[in-house]
Amino acid sequence: AITEAREEAKPYPLFPGPFPGSLQTDHTPLLSLPHASGYQPALMFSPTQPGRPHTGNVAIPQVTSVESKPLPPLAFKHTVGHIILSEHKGVKFNCSISVPNIYQDTTISWWKDGKELLGAHHAITQFYPDDEVTAIIASFSITSVQRSDNGSYICKMKINNEEIVSDPIYIEVQGLPHFTKQPESMNVTRNTAFNLTCQAVGPPEPVNIFWVQNSSRVNEQPEKSPSVLTVPGLTEMAVFSCEAHNDKGLTVSKGVQINIKAIPSPPTEVSIRNSTAHSILISWVPGFDGYSPFRNCSIQVKEADPLSNGSVMIFNTSALPHLYQIKQLQALANYSIGVSCMNEIGWSAVSPWILASTTEGAPSVAPLNVTVFLNESSDNVDIRWMKPPTKQQDGELVGYRISHVWQSAGISKELLEEVGQNGSRARISVQVHNATCTVRIAAVTRGGVGPFSDPVKIFIPAHGWVDYAPSSTPAPGNADPVLII
């Protein structure tokens, strides 16, 4: 929102030119050399002011005429020293010099702030020859001035390896204030003071600042730019802007929203990505962050079994990547899961709870009290065991896997048997006599095969030996038993 309140016309006298062809006359110059074509605005400041000595660089020509009279020193005529105008207006200014006709190939170049102006500038040099001298006028025009056109302009002419430099013409482009620093959007703690900064420049100076909060002026009198506003604290969102005023009018900064940090909204869309027997991978969509970055999240897990003690397991994790694998869960169990996240202000409420279940797992323990007998009469090995505790079955038992390895005289052979879940005994036929049979048993669920029991060894003698006693799972700490019957 930019408005220009007023435009001040600053009159500049147009001095009469000293010779024909001055741009204030209607004479047509004999020769016109345009450096660049372009619209030439009507506004014109006279290039000359006769009768004053020049203070810039002066070239004293060494050449004399036929009559051996020394030539006068060469210098640019005085011109207007300072032009003040509004942005987007047109301006034209010039340098003029009278050069004796003995000099050929004189060119005038324009310089701004120490740099030569080349290329598509609207510069025109006009020549007005007379009997002894040629008047040269170099005009420079800008059709629509901008702030970047501010600066010191000079003309330079080279004669006899001497450089003649004009007095500077200062161009001052005035306009509405221009912001160099505007207030920035911020997220702030409730009821906590904070600062906003506003800075604007002219010309013209001074630039005065008014602060506006929710369309009400904070300061009824202006403050010089730059201005820092200390806001004493907010309880709700507010919009701030600053107005910059100078003699040309006012410019209004962008409005910035200042938000109040709050606790986050609860996460939404908690979903199950994957379930295993002992872990559940969940994801969630974070809620609104309350204008303060999330720091971390907390996953709350409670057993959904009505007979459970209702204790809640809490897992803390980083806020990203909105994904967490909950571990150390029981197999084939139901859980309620909720997620809460925190920022610097505090914790969000818990998300809506979701129900999740772990899958069946392979049993986590082996069958207990494994005992092996040799039944010589039927040429079988009888195996007995106790099923693992229900808690550690990690699913519904579908049976058992029995591994029996027969070893004799350097030959080893492993066989596997599957047994239904009902029994807790099995019978396998003797494979080799005069050999050691090593038996291990694992419980099986749909989730897989559990660990095998510790090995139980029994020696199978040659035919005709007597079956004395069973072999059984050793007590903890004992070496592998070998029972020879």
Epitope: N191, W211, Q213, N214, S216, V218, N219, E220, Q221, P222, E223, L229, T230, P232, G233, T235, A238
Partner: antibody
Framework: QIQLVQSGSELKKPGASVKVSCKAS????????MNWVRQAPGQGLEWMGW????????TYADDFKGRFVFSLDTSVSTAYLQISSLKAEDTAVYFC???????????WGQGTLVTVSS | EIVLTQSPDFQSVTPKEKVTITCRAS?????MHWYQQKPDQSPKPWIY???NLASGVPSRFSGSGSGTDFTLTINSLEAEDAATYFC?????????FGQGTKLEIK
């Protein structure tokens, strides 16, 4: 330190005029606006308006348009309140107070009692 | 214009008691200022912009509120707190004051 010193009590007849002064010191006078606040005997505070000490432009609350005039003499850092055609109900203590950010009246004059009585 | 209504108008309180003065605005305001005035004195700035204590104000005072409801609280009243307290709103012209709450020590 910042001080606002007001002129002394005035006893006036109905129809007369009075001019109350408020001299500021301890800060740049033209940096802060000057408010005028009225307090009738035993009553609350009424904001009368303010004068921009930078531009000299006054702003009057609706109830104080007409007979009340705010003015300045920046050369002596003084604000003035003039009341013309005084009425009995103008009897009150008149305070000047600086106009800070958010219309915070951080500094107050000691008050000037104007009594209008025939 | 925004009308500010303070309650109570008058309160007689024993020392060490907690005191709450409320100021209700007829429509939402951005900030509420509070001033303390003792008899035959000018008002003193007391609480700036809802909750900021002016310099020299004891910490037993506090201010809070937003929108239309604002409060000045004295945690443990002392004899020197006997005075009239005025609220003043910022946010809408004209500036307005509450009618005042007079605190008396029993």
């Amino acid at each position: 330190q910042i001080q606002l010193v007001q002129s002394g009590s005035e006893l006036k007849k109905p129809g007369a005029s009075v001019k109350v002064s408020c001299k500021a010191s301890g800060y740049t006078f033209t940096n802060y606006g000057m408010n005028w606040v009225r307090q009738a005997p035993g009553q609350g505070l009424e904001w009368m308006g303010w004068i921009n000490t930078y531009t000299g432009e006054p702003t009057y609350a609706d109830d104080f348009k007409g007979r009340f005039v705010f003015s300045l003499d920046t050369s002596v850092s003084t604000a003035y309140l003039q009341i013309s055609s005084l009425k009995a109900e103008d009897t009150a203590v008149y305070f000047c107070a600086t106009y800070g950010h958010y219309a915070w009246f951080a500094y107050w004059g000691q008050g000037t009692l104007v009594t209008v009585s025939s | 214009e925004i009308v500010l209504t303070q309650s109570p108008d008058f309160q007689s309180v024993t020392p060490k008691e907690k005191v709450t003065i409320t100021c209700r605005a007829s429509s939402s305001v951005s900030y509420m200022h509070w001033y303390q005035q003792k008899p035959d004195q000018s008002p003193k700035p007391w609480i700036y912009a809802t909750s900021n204590l002016a310099s020299g104000v004891p910490s037993r005072f506090s201010g809070s509120g937003s929108g239309t409801d604002f409060t000045l609280t004295i945690n443990s009243l002392e004899a020197e707190d006997a005075a009239t307290y005025f609220c003043q709103q910022w946010g809408t012209k004209p500036l307005t004051f509450g009618q005042g709450t007079k605190l008396e020590i029993k």
